[in-house]
């Protein structure tokens, strides 16, 4: 079968980093600078990806794969493959439309990206503040305050929240 | 790839409970917020339930005191445990996750009728 | 905790521009984001942020705002893009939600 499609088709002996130049009587050609084909058989090199401006080189374009961007230091990536950047802020602010903005009292955000979220309520799981929130940080909730009676063990405070969507997976 | 898938939805009558899933795969729950929606028919999105990843919960005074939301860590599914169900509550309901100032990605959806 | 208002019906004639508006107070410190749901279907972002679009999105949509609106514009509507349109916007309260009440888009 791979013989017949051959003849029918001289492209699909092309291989990645090449494509089929019907310039040159389908002539498997290397892919020009700048340029490459991740798959065999193409008709044309696509353009590598630039990484300019805001974005830097994570990964070099070849002649089989395309250059991957990261953002410079004070951005962080948005979409799919890093398509774009977003202004970094400091943990206890959020991002609006006029620049990062401190959180509001009662406001918390742990990371650099995201928004400024309300602590949580201890007293609505009859529970108890141990550790009052900041701008940073949420509040960590205790023993409710019936609970707590002489030599009672404190509770451990759970790690800080991760950022939505940018956490390890 | 980034997705969530529902399931769960049905008939059922007033007063009564259900519980709806939404599994994701491309993301760990636990690690993000996340939120259940609803949309009634022929009506827009109204906001249900939030977790955070603390496990923090909150929700729209509309379900509170009748609907929780959970989730289940080991098997990265979201949970929405509905009881006392009305008629009101008739509606599609969506997870999603909540990357702060939008939502993506959204489950498909899954139709919860509540009615004699 | 504030309100997004929406025109509830616009239509476009096939590859002509149409430009979808909401209006509220969060629009004066957040950005919108915007999604499309067709009949039968989930909501799928199509907007978010300043003016970012999702991969496999066209870039016949972007976005826009100005002071307490924010505009989704489709420059040469297709036939695929008749749907509702909802903005979206954090409220003050971060964990409260706010979206407006949809837009039917007709492409004639």
């Known amino acids: 079968f791979e013989r017949t499609r051959s003849l029918q088709d001289p492209c699909s002996n092309c291989p990645a980093g090449t494509f089929c130049d019907n310039n040159r009587n389908q002539i498997c050609s290397p892919c020009p600078p700048n340029s490459f084909s991740s798959a065999g058989g193409q008709r044309t090199c696509d353009i590598c990806r630039q990484c300019k401006g805001v974005f830097r080189t994570r990964k070099e374009c070849s002649s089989t794969s395309n250059a991957e961007c990261d953002c410079t230091p004070g951005f962080h990536c948005l979409g799919a493959g890093c398509s774009m950047c977003e202004q970094d802020c400091k943990q206890g602010q959020e991002l609006t439309k006029k620049g990062c903005k401190d959180c509001c009292f009662g406001t918390f955000n742990d990371q650099k990206r995201g928004i400024c979220r309300p602590w949580t309520n201890c007293s609505l799981d009859g529970k108890s503040v141990l550790v009052n929130g900041t701008k940073e940080r949420d509040v960590v909730c205790g023993p409710s305050p019936a609970d707590l009676s002489p030599g009672a063990s404190s509770v451990t405070p759970p790690a800080p929240a991760r950022e939505p969507g940018h956490s390890p997976q | 790839q980034v997705q969530l898938v529902q399931s769960g939805g049905g008939l059922i009558q007033p007063g009564g409970s259900l519980r709806l899933s939404c599994a994701a795969s491309g993301f760990t729950v636990s690690n993000n917020y996340m939120r259940w929606v609803r949309q009634a028919p022929g009506k827009g999105l109204e906001w249900v339930s939030l977790?955070?990843?603390?496990?923090?919960?909150y929700y729209a005074d509309s379900v509170k005191g009748r609907f929780t939301i959970s989730r289940d860590n080991s098997k990265n599914t979201l949970y929405l445990q509905m009881n006392s169900l009305r008629a009101e509550d008739t509606a599609v309901y969506y997870c999603?996750?909540?990357?702060?100032?939008?939502?993506?990605?959204w489950g498909q959806g899954t139709l919860v009728t509540v009615s004699s | 905790s504030s309100e997004l208002t929406q025109d509830p019906a616009v239509s476009v004639a096939l590859g002509q521009t149409v430009r979808i508006t909401c209006q509220g107070d969060?629009?004066?410190?957040?950005?919108a984001s915007w999604y499309q749901q067709k009949p039968g279907q989930a909501p799928v972002l199509v907007i978010y942020g300043k003016n970012n679009r999702p991969s496999g999105i066209p870039d016949r949509f972007s976005g826009s705002s100005s002071g307490n609106t924010a505009s989704l514009t489709i420059t040469g509507a297709q036939a695929e893009d008749e749907a509702d349109y909802y903005c979206?916007?954090?409220?003050?309260?971060?964990?409260?939600?706010?979206f407006g009440g949809g837009t039917k888009l007709t492409v004639l």
């Open positions: 977790i955070y990843s603390t496990g923090t919960t």
């Open positions: 969060s629009l004066r410190s957040y950005y």
């Open positions: 999603a996750r909540d990357r702060g100032q939008w939502f993506d990605p």
């Open positions: 979206h916007s954090r409220d003050s309260n971060g964990n409260h939600v706010i």
